[in-house]
Amino acid sequence: KVFGRCELAAAMKRHGLDNYRGYSLGNWVCAAKFESNFNTQATNRNTDGSTDYGILQINSRWWCNDGRTPGSRNLCNIPCSALLSSDITASVNCAKKIVSDGNGMNAWVAWRNRCKGTDVQAWIRGCRL
């Protein structure tokens, strides 16, 4: 599923991401935009043999199990395919674990490069939340 901007903002808010670990909802929507272009089925392969999955491009080396990433830690204890569902529950729950890990949203390269220090509230402006 490819979410609309406000549709995703509403879904993320429903799942408790607004101000989760101090990160406003705009940060999460911005991260999803630049990680996956709001596409729940996005997959991207990395040079280390791992793959990133879903709307927040969660990595199989650390967070989920795709059955083929050497040394996978699977810290969210889920199959990576669960992160590709049109229901974003699994992605949100895993993202909460990631953002609590010490580096905050710096774990997402796209957030660091494209969202951090910008007017992220623009990503939820005009949305009825």
Partner: antibody, heavy 116, light 107 residues
């Protein structure tokens, strides 16, 4: 136990298309990538590409882009590979395998012969 | 693409001999190297995964070693059922690639 059952041998004319199937049993089909591999005598094994049935995500070896197309039907736990514009170079045995990085589980292979 | 070069192309041995098959990668692939055995008209069978881990049900006479670019499959005291083709495969990057194979034949 995990099993991959491929469709039977095919004899096709040049220029035609063929669709090979791979039915998976014994595991959660949507969770693992399915890989496709080509084997021709004297050419060894070649990786064609892969599909993640749960999402339909696909990756292709550059060499097979435009030649192979992958699809999957999660209701029947079956992956498909369509090969188009067939030539004699496509005559080979085609295998599906479960994509565990290494391939512990293979189909029995589908022999494709392209001949006028 | 990562190229895998296997040597020798053919190995003629007597049952009871011990043999080593080589697989060399064109660049470092850590331990992401797997070995397969294939008999005529059969699918490949996984022997060794991640350079040195024996796959389920594989006899202890098969062992693997190596890391980086140089890998070895060793068969301690070859048995008649071991004859066939042996392939290596890398899963370090895409596209996945296979070696050209080593044929193990009876002398």
């Amino acid at each position: 136990q995990v099993q991959l059952q491929e469709s039977g041998a095919e004899v096709m004319k040049p220029g035609a298309s063929v669709k090979i199937s791979c039915k998976a049993t014994g595991y959660t089909f949507t969770t693992y990538w399915i890989e496709w591999v080509k084997q021709r005598p004297g050419h060894g094994l070649e990786w064609i590409g892969e599909i993640l049935p749960g999402s339909g995500s696909t990756y292709y070896n550059e060499k097979f882009k435009g030649k192979a197309t992958f699809t999957a039907d999660t209701s029947s736990n079956t992956a498909y590979m369509q090969l188009s514009s067939l030539t004699s170079e496509d005559s080979a045995v085609y295998y599906c395998a479960r994509g565990d990085g290494n391939y512990c589980y293979w189909g029995q292979g589908t022999t494709l012969t392209v001949s006028s | 693409d990562i190229e895998l070069t296997q040597s020798p192309a053919t190995l003629s041995v007597t049952p009871g001999d011990s043999v080593s098959l080589s697989c060399r990668a064109s660049q470092s692939i850590s331990n992401n190297l797997h070995w397969y055995q294939q008999k005529p008209h059969e699918s490949p069978r996984l022997l060794i995964k991640y350079a040195s881990q024996r796959a389920s049900g594989i006899p202890s006479r098969f062992s693997g070693s190596g890391s980086g670019t140089d890998f070895t499959l060793s068969i301690n005291s070859v048995e008649t059922e071991d004859f066939g083709m042996y392939f290596c495969q890398q899963s370090n990057s895409w596209p996945r690639t296979f070696g050209g194979g080593t044929k193990l034949e009876i002398k």
